[in-house]
């Protein structure tokens, strides 16, 4: 069964800066990745970035830099100030659309006890949906 993992890290140097890493553990071909915050995409979440393997990357503030890390994983750096700034309990979600598996989404946030500079382990997150 395919899985999605989400890792959230707060940068020690900039407390309003987060790095989100997501990956798809499956054999299919990824056609689109959508990163959102505040909940799953389409369920109250706000889209931060859309990564298309062929067409490029579209990102919205406060997303600063989204990138493909491998064929099946991405990273997104967020930085914000004021209303658009993420906070420690913000939930980030990654949705991978792949063929032939369909769409798989997982969400994660900073562990409650994590210090700046530490990150959640890159394990499959508890919220997992298959469309």
């Amino acid at each position: 069964t395919p899985e999605v993992w989400v890792q959230v890290r707060m940068e020690a140097t900039e407390l309003s800066s987060f790095t989100i890493r997501c990956g798809f553990l499956g054999s299919g071909s990824i056609s689109l990745v959508t990163v959102s915050w505040g909940g799953p995409n389409g369920a109250g979440g706000t889209t931060l970035a859309v990564l298309h393997p062929e067409r490029g990357i579209r990102q919205w503030a406060p997303a600063r830099q989204a990138r493909w890390e491998t064929q099946s994983s991405i990273s997104l750096i967020l930085e914000g100030s004021g209303a658009s700034s993420p906070c420690a309990n913000t939930t980030f979600c990654c949705k991978f659309a792949s063929f032939p598996e369909g769409s798989w989404e997982a969400c994660g946030s900073l562990p409650p006890s994590s210090d700046p500079g530490l990150s959640a382990p890159p394990t499959p997150a508890p919220i997992l949906r298959a469309d």
Epitope: G56, I57, R67, T70
Partner: antibody, heavy 120, light 113 residues
Framework: EVHLQQSGPELVKPGASVKISCKAS????????MNWMKQSHGKGLEWIGE????????NYSQKFRDKATLTVDKSSNTAFMKLRSLTSEDSAVYFC?????????????WGQGTSVTVSS | DIVMTQSPSSLAMSVGQKVTMSCKSS????????????LAWYQQKPGQSPKLLVS???TRESGVPDRFIGGGSGTDFTLTISSVQPEDLADYFC?????????FGEGTKLEIK
């Protein structure tokens, strides 16, 4: 054939606003984002932002977030850009450009440009 | 934002000569997903709007003469005109189309001797 027809040149006073238009033809207007660029002599080409004609969602460059407002009228296949609180720094040629078929930001068709001159 | 740097700022060539202009990006435009470089070249003739010549560093747009050749990968790119023609008098801009916001180089002005 794809064509983007922009409105004519504008001469406006400092502090005023201006709204320029870009009428699209030759393709399905709601299938592709519309981008807007500024071209001035000192700074070359700068991306202002983009709008999704399907739902009106916008995405602005941080630099132009307080300067430009992008809208569309789906019934007439027209995109608009309003520029506010104009100063001499806003004097430039402004282009609309269609999102590429193969890539979000390789813009494959451009309007002819609209010259905006800010002068008292 | 990704910074694009072009060189030279201008050059003058005779008809039939080969010309190469350069573009560098402040970070890699190579996608780890598909190994494509998201770099475009535009031609802007005097008084006209920009015209897309090349995307993905080396893919020529339909209708663009084959004397226009895009090359390079990662952070270093070139546009070569194998045999300059009088109608090639124009400004040439590179642009990264990897991610938001798309950013442009300052341009290379090609003059014909």
């Amino acid at each position: 054939e794809v064509h983007l027809q922009q409105s004519g040149p504008e001469l406006v006073k400092p502090g005023a606003s201006v709204k320029i238009s870009c009428k699209a033809s030759g393709y399905t207007f709601t299938d592709y984002y519309m981008n807007w660029m500024k071209q001035s002599h000192g700074k070359g080409l700068e991306w202002i932002g983009e709008i999704n004609p399907k739902n009106g969602d916008t995405n602005y460059s941080q630099k132009f977030r307080d300067k430009a407002t992008l809208t569309v009228d789906k019934s007439s296949n027209t995109a608009f850009m309003k520029l506010r609180s104009l100063t001499s720094e806003d004097s430039a040629v402004y282009f609309c450009a269609k999102e590429g078929v193969g890539s979000y930001y390789a813009m494959d068709y451009w309007g002819q440009g609209t010259s905006v001159t800010v002068s008292s | 934002d990704i910074v694009m740097t072009q060189s030279p700022s201008s050059l003058a060539m005779s008809v039939g000569q080969k010309v190469t202009m350069s573009c560098k990006s402040s970070q890699s435009l190579l996608s780890s997903n598909n190994q494509k470089s998201f770099l475009a070249w535009y031609q802007q003739k005097p008084g006209q709007s920009p015209k897309l010549l090349v995307s993905f560093a080396s893919t020529r747009e339909s209708g663009v003469p084959d004397r226009f050749i895009g090359g390079g990968s990662g952070t270093d790119f070139t546009l070569t005109i194998s045999s300059v023609q009088p109608e090639d008098l124009a400004d040439y801009f590179c642009q990264q189309h990897y991610s938001t916001p798309p950013t442009f180089g300052e341009g290379t002005k090609l003059e014909i001797k």
